[in-house]
């Protein structure tokens, strides 16, 4: 089958990194500079992605693979293949239409990206607040008020970290 296919279509013999040049009797020509073909049998080579401005080159373009970009310091990637770069904020902030803004009271963000999320409501799990939340940190829930009977230890080791608002499984 491969042999018949080759007889029918000489382009199928052209490997990655080349293209089937119609102007030259369908011989396999190397991809020109700043272009690539990642599969065999291509009739054209694709233009390499250019990492410019806020984007920087993570991997150079080669004749067989496209360039890969990431973001310059102070920015982080968004979208498939890092199609966008978004400015970082500080912990305790979120990026809004008007720039980096502090998290509102009752919310926190422990990363340089993403949105402010509500503090965990300890009482939903029948627990009390052991450590108050801040703009940068979620509250730490402690034992339930009923557990704090006279003579009982008032401080217990914190439970393993979990997503705010989610009950333990």
């Amino acid at each position: 089958f491969e042999r018949t296919r080759s007889l029918q279509d000489p382009c199928s013999n052209c490997p990655a990194g080349t293209f089937c040049d119609n102007n030259r009797n369908q011989i396999c020509s190397p991809c020109p500079p700043n272009s690539f073909s990642s599969a065999g049998g291509q009739r054209t080579c694709d233009i390499c992605r250019q990492c410019k401005g806020v984007f920087r080159t993570r991997k150079e373009c080669s004749s067989t693979s496209n360039a890969e970009c990431d973001c310059t310091p102070g920015f982080h990637c968004l979208g498939a293949g890092c199609s966008m770069c978004e400015q970082d904020c500080k912990q305790g902030q979120e990026l809004t239409k008007k720039g980096c803004k502090d998290c509102c009271f009752g919310t926190f963000n422990d990363q340089k990206r993403g949105i402010c999320r509500p503090w965990t409501n300890c009482s939903l799990d029948g627990k009390s607040v052991l450590v108050n939340g801040t703009k940068e940190r979620d509250v730490v829930c402690g034992p339930s008020p009923a557990d704090l009977s006279p003579g009982a230890s008032s401080v217990t080791p914190p439970a393993p970290a979990r997503e705010p608002g989610h009950s333990p499984q």
């Epitope: 401005g53 966008m84 978004e86 400015q87 990026l95």
Partner: nanobody
Framework: EVQLLESGGGLVQPGGSLRLSCAAS????????MSWARQAPGKGLEWVSG???????YYTESVKDRFTISRDNSKNTVYLQMNSLKPEDTAVYYC????????????????WGQGTLVTVSS
Amino acid sequence: EVQLLESGGGLVQPGGSLRLSCAASGFTFSSSAMSWARQAPGKGLEWVSGIYSGGSTYYTESVKDRFTISRDNSKNTVYLQMNSLKPEDTAVYYCATWGTLRFGVWAEYDHWGQGTLVTVSS
């Protein structure tokens, strides 16, 4: 071919003013949002200001009330008027298209100029 050419940079004393210009060609300027970014020596890039095609303007906190972005669609040019300049405004200033329309976000299809150096020093 898209081209963005910045001009107007230079040396200025603290408290002084400068107006940067960015002449655009190779695309439909009047319907494109535009932005300014800057990179201080040894620091990362910073989003400074943006202007929508309709004229709405956005600024990063540190330049609010001191910098003004504007555009002249008849001249395919965007401007950045910088007043009350401080030493910390020293940077290379870049003009860029702003296809995402989102504060602090650029996309891979955006185009960038080569930059113009602004030095604020006595």
